[in-house]
Amino acid sequence: SEVEYRAEVGQNAYLPCFYTPAAPGNLVPVCWGKGACPVFECGNVVLRTDERDVNYWTSRYWLNGDFRKGDVSLTIENVTLADSGIYCCRIQIPGIMNDEKFNLKLVIKPAKVTPAPTRQRDFTAAFPRMLTTRGHGPAETQTLGSLPDINLTQISTLANELRDSRLANDLRDSGATIRIG
């Protein structure tokens, strides 16, 4: 089952996906697609990286993290209800059937009529490391763009890294529901 992520209409959505490069600068191609991961590659590609850089992206989709360090989490700008659905992050590790695929479910909620303060600000203040764009797209921060430094030892989605952690509870309380499938 897919891990579920939530965002409100008009906000930026954040879909986490990470891998650990074998060596600095030794990047693995990654594709992001709308729709579940097919048998090969990504369907309806919205963003793609190669061994060096982001080599394809469409408007509103970018990587806010440092993809050169394996943070290939996808940001979707100014989401609408039509952005709801499953997204595929595929880490295209060379070799025979080596690539890793992750299906992430994005649920878009209607915007609140009267925005009220939430614990989101507390969360942001607690983790001041802001993720900014690299290479293209507007350089901006976002609601869930502030994350603690995590030592990633294996290919994983953020949900795996957050399992049974206090941070997962903070995220859940702040309205960014992560359901561990």
């Epitope: 191609p29 729709g35 579940a36 991961c37 097919p38 048998v39 090969f40 590659e41 990504c42 369907g43 499953i86 295209q92 060379p94 070799g95 025979i96 059937m97 080596n98 690539d99 299906n103």
Partner: antibody
Framework: QVHLVESGGGLVKPGGSLRLSCTAF????MSWIRQAPGKGLEWLSY????????YYADSVKGRFTISRDNAKNSVYLQMNSLRAEDTAVYYC??????????WGPGTLVTVSS | EIVLTQSPGTLSLSPGERATLSCRAS???????LAWYQQKPGQAPRLLIY???SRATGIPDRFSGSGSGTDFTLTISRLEPEDFAVYYC?????????FGPGTKVDIK
């Protein structure tokens, strides 16, 4: 216009080897698919445009090897330890995510003593 | 692996009639990753439909696909003489890729 052509088929004895070739441009994601006489279609193997990502069906894993030479616009299927049940028409087909929009005409491989 | 079952095995119809071919999957096909192909004797298969309902380039609009989950349908609204052939469905949502056994559409 996409134009795929297979070659290398023929008669081979059980236990023998054969290497099939397919013309394919370097940006094509390619698969080999076979069809035994009077039977349905069976996907065998896939190779990405760069050649870095490879998949095999369990039925041929360890016996068949897919590869490509983009300088020669070619994709290959090396078939070892051939069995009678490998007798089929072998097609190369273009397909990035798993469906195939262009196919070659096929080449017949007959495994018989 | 996902097993695809096609029915009927053979469909005998006359030109001008409507053909409805069924493809059923043993488990749900994610994101409707299902394709349909036409194959005539001595020829390679030809892609008709991908993504369950999208027509491939150059395919006449008398061919249409529908369905999701485990049940998919290929419809030929009015059979032309060149449509008599074998039709295969194929899923590409989960490994390994699998094809159905085919439905033969022949002239009544």
């Amino acid at each position: 216009q996409v134009h795929l052509v297979e070659s290398g088929g023929g008669l081979v004895k059980p236990g023998g080897s054969l290497r099939l070739s397919c013309t394919a441009f370097s940006d094509y994601y390619m698969s080999w698919i076979r069809q035994a006489p009077g039977k349905g279609l069976e996907w065998l193997s896939y190779i990405s445009n760069s050649g870095s990502i490879i998949y095999y069906a369990d039925s041929v894993k360890g016996r068949f090897t897919i590869s490509r030479d983009n300088a020669k616009n070619s994709v290959y299927l090396q078939m070892n330890s051939l069995r009678a049940e490998d007798t089929a028409v072998y097609y190369c087909a273009r397909g990035r995510i798993g469906f195939f929009d262009y196919w070659g005409p096929g080449t017949l491989v007959t495994v018989s003593s | 692996e996902i097993v695809l079952t096609q029915s009927p095995g053979t469909l005998s119809l006359s030109p001008g009639e409507r053909a409805t071919l069924s493809c059923r999957a043993s488990q749900s096909v994610s994101s409707s990753y299902l394709a349909w192909y036409q194959q005539k004797p001595g020829q390679a298969p030809r892609l008709l439909i991908y993504g369950a309902s999208s027509r491939a380039t150059g395919i006449p609009d008398r061919f249409s696909g529908s369905g999701s989950g485990t049940d998919f349908t290929l419809t030929i609204s009015r059979l032309e003489p060149e449509d008599f052939a074998v039709y295969y469905c194929q899923q590409y949502g989960s490994s390994p890729l699998t094809f159905g056994p085919g439905t033969k559409v022949d002239i009544k």
